[in-house]
Interface confidence: low
């Protein structure tokens, strides 16, 4: 808290300029007025203030705007941003997609800090859905941000925003939220033909049911193993030997790599030998010829 | 590792001069400012002088006139000429540098340990 003094004679701020860096902390608090802090806010990012004088240039800020910031200002924070506390930015109303961009500049290259979080949070809940152009620019900022969501937060993206997404958006993603995404994308892409369609669906296969990527396996696709390890071993265990190896076409070869791990393992131990051996690849564990398979969970749905 | 080491301080008579030094390494890039501060004994901390990466300077009111700021042609180093010095100039002067143009002076930045300038 800065105690209250009168201004020393002639160092009545007149402007926020370069010149105040030089002043003491109760001589910022004594001569600076906080409205004209507030329509020149815009020049305080350009000086090197320290943040023991930022402290003091929000203490001002925070005194003429208890309710909380008008956006005028907030767009205009810059680095000051750095200085508010997640509490404070709950008072704010963010609409333009401008302020966020401004203030998502000033933590580039940092992870997603709490004031991010809640800024981004306050922005969302504000728009009442997670457009295009918000997610385009949340994602060039923070490329895992889809992925912080929680499935319930996700269901709020309309198919339209799918177009923004990147691959590398989608690294940390975990199976549940890929369930939320797929059919959003599956939606959002369902005019491209064939070729297209994979490019752009296959970051979001790991949601893919297995009705959906029996139907790829009859379209020439070549999946990379990569892309075949990512997807739910309860889609990939009904498929036959036959379509995993459509489905992966020249990458059939790297199963033998995987054998050992999910969802492969799981997968061989569900085949035949007998089809197994058809792949030429040594798999091995598949079901012995003369063995006869039942589907209890066939059975269970018919009792 | 980032490093700043000062040197050049000492005990100089009132009106003298002293030039202090201040090698920086380790840094992967000055895209901006350097500065000195000094903190008399007892006192806070205060920004003495500033240059930032275009070459434009800053001088607090005491010290304008008397005191020049530069950095060296290798750009890792700073300089501080002190001519005409007082008593009151007396203190521990720091250099430090800030890893980009805009924004506030400690958000990103790098401290030196300090020398010492005692004017009698």
């Known amino acids: 808290e800065v105690e209250k003094t009168a201004c020393p004679s002639g160092k009545k701020a007149r402007e926020i300029d370069e010149s105040l860096i030089f002043y003491k902390k109760w001589e910022l608090e004594a001569c600076v007025d906080a409205a004209l802090l507030a329509t020149q806010m815009d020049r305080v990012n350009a000086i090197p203030f320290t943040y023991e004088q930022l402290d003091v240039l929000k203490h001002k800020l925070d005194e003429l705007y208890p309710q909380g910031y008008p956006e005028s200002v907030i767009q205009h924070l810059g680095y000051l941003f750095l200085k508010m506390s997640p509490e404070d930015i709950r008072k704010w109303n963010v609409t333009s997609l401008e302020t966020l961009k401004a203030l998502l500049e000033v933590n580039k290259g940092h992870e997603m800090s709490p004031q991010v979080a809640t800024l981004i949070d306050r922005f969302v809940k504000g728009r009442g859905q997670l457009d295009k152009d918000t997610l385009d620019t949340l994602t060039a900022f923070y490329p895992g941000y889809l992925c912080s969501l929680s499935p319930e937060e996700l269901s709020s993206v309309p198919p339209s925003s799918i177009w923004a997404v990147r691959p590398q958006d989608l690294d940390t993603c975990d199976p549940r939220q890929l369930d939320v995404l797929y059919p959003k994308a599956r939606l959002a892409f369902q005019n491209m033909n064939g070729s297209e369609y994979f490019v752009k669906i296959q970051s979001f296969l790991g949601g893919a049911p297995t009705e959906d990527l029996k139907a790829l396996s009859q379209q020439n696709v070549s999946m990379d193993l990569a892309t075949f390890m990512k997807l739910r071993t309860d889609a990939v265990l009904p498929l036959t030997v036959a379509e995993v190896q459509k489905l992966l076409g020249p990458h059939v070869e790297g199963l033998k790599a995987e054998e050992r791990h999910r969802p492969v393992r799981d997968w061989i131990l569900r085949q035949r030998q007998d089809d197994l051996d058809t792949l030429g690849l040594g798999l091995q564990g598949g079901i012995p010829n003369g063995y006869l398979v039942l589907d209890l969970s066939m059975q269970e749905a018919l009792s | 590792d980032v490093q700043l080491v000062e040197s050049g301080g000492g005990l100089v008579q009132a009106g003298g001069s002293l030039r202090l030094s201040c090698a920086a390494s380790?840094?992967?890039?000055?895209?901006?400012?350097m500065s000195w501060h000094r903190q008399a004994p007892g006192k806070d901390r205060e920004l003495v002088s500033s240059?930032?990466?275009?070459?434009?300077?800053h001088y607090a009111d005491s010290v304008r006139g008397r005191f020049t700021i530069s950095k060296g042609n290798a750009r890792n180093t700073l300089y501080l000429q002190m001519n005409s010095l007082k008593p009151e100039d007396t203190a521990v002067y720091f250099c430090?540098?800030?890893?980009?143009?805009?924004?506030?002076?400690?958000?990103?930045?790098?401290w030196g340990q300090g020398t010492s300038v005692t004017v009698s």
């Open positions: 240059i930032s990466s275009d070459g434009s300077t």
């Open positions: 430090a540098a800030y890893p980009r143009q805009l924004g506030p002076y400690y958000a990103m930045d790098y």
């Open positions: 380790g840094f992967p890039y000055f895209s901006c400012c």
